[in-house]
């Protein structure tokens, strides 16, 4: 609970926000969890705390670990954990999966690619953008504020896009890069009333208390680019984001095109540390597009331990 994963590359700047945010102006203390050693606030240090932010200027592989932040108040201290991993720079062009931010998809009508985490940094335009390690050149590519716009998107524009910018701290400059995949929706095709492939209607999913569980909502909507298509999970009729249980999060999967050419979407619901109260909730997989909405309901049941007979 109140934990967040952050990652970066050695010799680049990395700034991490306390996952347990108070309002601005509250005192935030940072500690290195393994040693309980306080992180200094003096900016002359390579790693220092600045309110809700923890700054690695620049980061080193040895900085990897769990950092504790405590938002201080005389009556209500609030603790969060930042799980930081710093990786060595790759010599080749490949960006490994563990360095990738969430995938975004675009179409001819909408082709914005936002630069991940950039809002945490003190940067000035323009951003530099690369696709599969090649600098983007040509009038089709426009770096605008914190995102890239691609004109007349084509299938070939799919790939891994890296934004590069400079973070400035007291006159010193530090490089930052962040990479995410971009997928292109085909504009040709047709749409159907959503068909949910998983889960089955009124499915009972067996889970173990204390373990993690994943539920996948998978639906197909037609062929080619879908103007409006979404899959999402609801808990007791409430959106996951509104339900406010950090243990239960939904994570968008890859857009899928099966061999029959259907456009399908996945949404994985991840339940960390399953609790008894989770068994009382109703889990709804919703698939919707312009034709309408289809809902499949799942309930959780406790997995009985297997009896071992000699």
């Amino acid at each position: 609970k109140f934990s967040k994963q952050s990652w970066g590359l050695e010799n680049e700047a990395l700034i991490v926000r306390c996952p347990r945010q108070g309002k601005p102006s509250y005192t935030v203390d940072w500690y290195y969890s393994q040693t309980n050693k306080s992180i200094p606030t003096q900016e002359r240090n390579r790693v220092f705390a600045s309110g809700q932010l923890l700054k690695f200027l620049p980061a080193a592989v040895a900085d990897s670990g769990i950092y504790t932040c405590i938002v201080r108040s005389p009556t209500f201290n609030r603790t969060g954990y930042a799980n930081v991993t710093i990786y060595k720079k790759q010599s080749d062009c490949n960006v490994p999966d563990y360095l990738m931010y969430s995938t975004v998809s675009g179409s001819e009508k909408n082709s914005k690619i936002y630069c991940p985490t950039i809002d945490l940094y003190n940067w000035t335009a323009p951003l530099e953008w690369f696709k599969n390690c090649q600098a983007l050149q040509g009038s089709r590519y426009r770096a605008h504020k914190s995102f890239l716009v691609i004109d007349n998107v084509m299938t070939e524009d799919a790939g891994d896009y890296t934004c590069k910018f400079i973070h400035n701290e007291n006159g010193a400059n530090y490089s930052v890069t962040a990479t995410r995949s971009f997928t292109v929706k085909d504009e040709q095709g047709f749409s159907l009333f959503p068909v949910i492939g998983a889960p089955a209607q009124n499915e009972i999913k067996e889970v173990e208390i204390g373990k993690n569980a994943n539920l996948t909502c998978s639906a197909c909507f037609g062929k080619g680019t879908q103007f409006l298509a979404a899959v999402l999970w609801q808990l007791n009729g409430t959106k996951i984001t509104d339900f406010g249980e950090p243990r239960i999060q939904q994570e968008e999967g890859q857009n899928q095109s099966f061999s029959n050419g259907l456009a399908c979407l996945d949404m994985v619901l991840r339940i960390a540390d399953v609790k008894e109260e989770d068994l009382l909730l109703q889990y709804d997989c919703l698939a919707l597009n312009l034709h309408g909405l289809r809902r499949h309901t799942v309930r959780l049941s406790r997995k009985n331990p297997i009896d071992h007979h000699s």
Epitope: R20, G22, T27, S73, P74, D242, P246
Partner: antibody, heavy 117, light 111 residues
Framework: QVQLQESGPGLVKPSQTLSLTCTVS?????????WDWIRQPPGKGLEWIGY???????YYNPSLKSRVTISRDTSKNQFSLKLSSVTAADTAVYYC??????????WGQGTLVTVSS | DIVLTQSPASLAVSPGQRATITCRAS??????????MHWYQQKPGQPPKLLIY???NLESGVPARFSGSGSGTDFTLTINPVEANDTANYYC?????????FGQGTKLEIK
């Protein structure tokens, strides 16, 4: 957006127990924050009764502690107030609210409870 | 308990003028560089609404006409310029220790 709604009897007899429930939508009460009860006698100022944190820990105003119980029902996303041995001085608008840090950031509309025989 | 005393009990101000409300604590509510004093506005028939936290920080969505200042035991809420819809009761609240307490309130009327 956190939304809170108080419910319970509007009239309680002296010496009986006042019971109110606050139903929370848009956020799980076990996720974070503290969940408060505050009251305001007609035409008067505000008095903090106490709160229950996301962890289940409770904190009460010492002036009411002997008579107050704040509890929660996590399956319904509700928290409740019980105030025993009420007198006319307990007549007030009772509010539930959310303390995110030190301040009450979201409030219910309030419910008037009158103590009278 | 920390007792908060607001003054004046009521005041009337013309639109465009400045309104100043003070709150005095029976002991210091400041520690570790922060002052744990907050201000609320309550209009008739409505719940209170947070205006200022930690003595001087404007809550998100609150107009910049509202400002707070002070430290230790003496705090001020200033509304400048006052508008017609600022008619309300204003309360200070501390969170330096338990129990959390409120001031008795100040009634602001617009002339």
């Amino acid at each position: 957006q956190v939304q809170l709604q108080e419910s319970g009897p509007g009239l309680v007899k002296p010496s009986q127990t006042l019971s109110l429930t606050c139903t929370v939508s848009g956020y799980s009460i076990t996720s974070d924050y503290a969940w408060d009860w505050i009251r305001q006698p007609p035409g008067k100022g505000l008095e903090w009764i106490g709160y229950i944190r996301y962890s289940g820990d409770t904190y009460y105003n010492p002036s009411l502690k002997s008579r107050v119980t704040i509890s929660r029902d996590t399956s319904k996303n509700q928290f409740s107030l019980k105030l025993s041995s009420v007198t006319a001085a307990d007549t007030a608008v009772y509010y539930c609210a959310t303390t995110m840090m030190d301040t009450m950031d979201y409030w219910g509309q309030g419910t008037l409870v009158t103590v009278s025989s | 308990d920390i007792v908060l005393t607001q003054s004046p009990a009521s005041l009337a101000v013309s639109p465009g003028q400045r309104a100043t409300i003070t709150c005095r604590a029976s002991k210091s509510v400041s520690t570790s560089g922060n002052s744990y004093m907050h201000w609320y506005q309550q209009k008739p028939g409505q719940p209170p609404k947070l205006l200022i936290y930690l003595a001087s920080n404007l809550e998100s969505g609150v107009p910049a006409r509202f400002s707070g200042s002070g430290s230790g035991t003496d705090f001020t809420l200033t509304i400048n310029p006052v508008e017609a819809n600022d008619t309300a009761n204003y309360y200070c609240q501390h969170s330096r220790e338990f129990p959390l307490t409120f001031g008795q309130g100040t009634k602001l009327e617009i002339k």
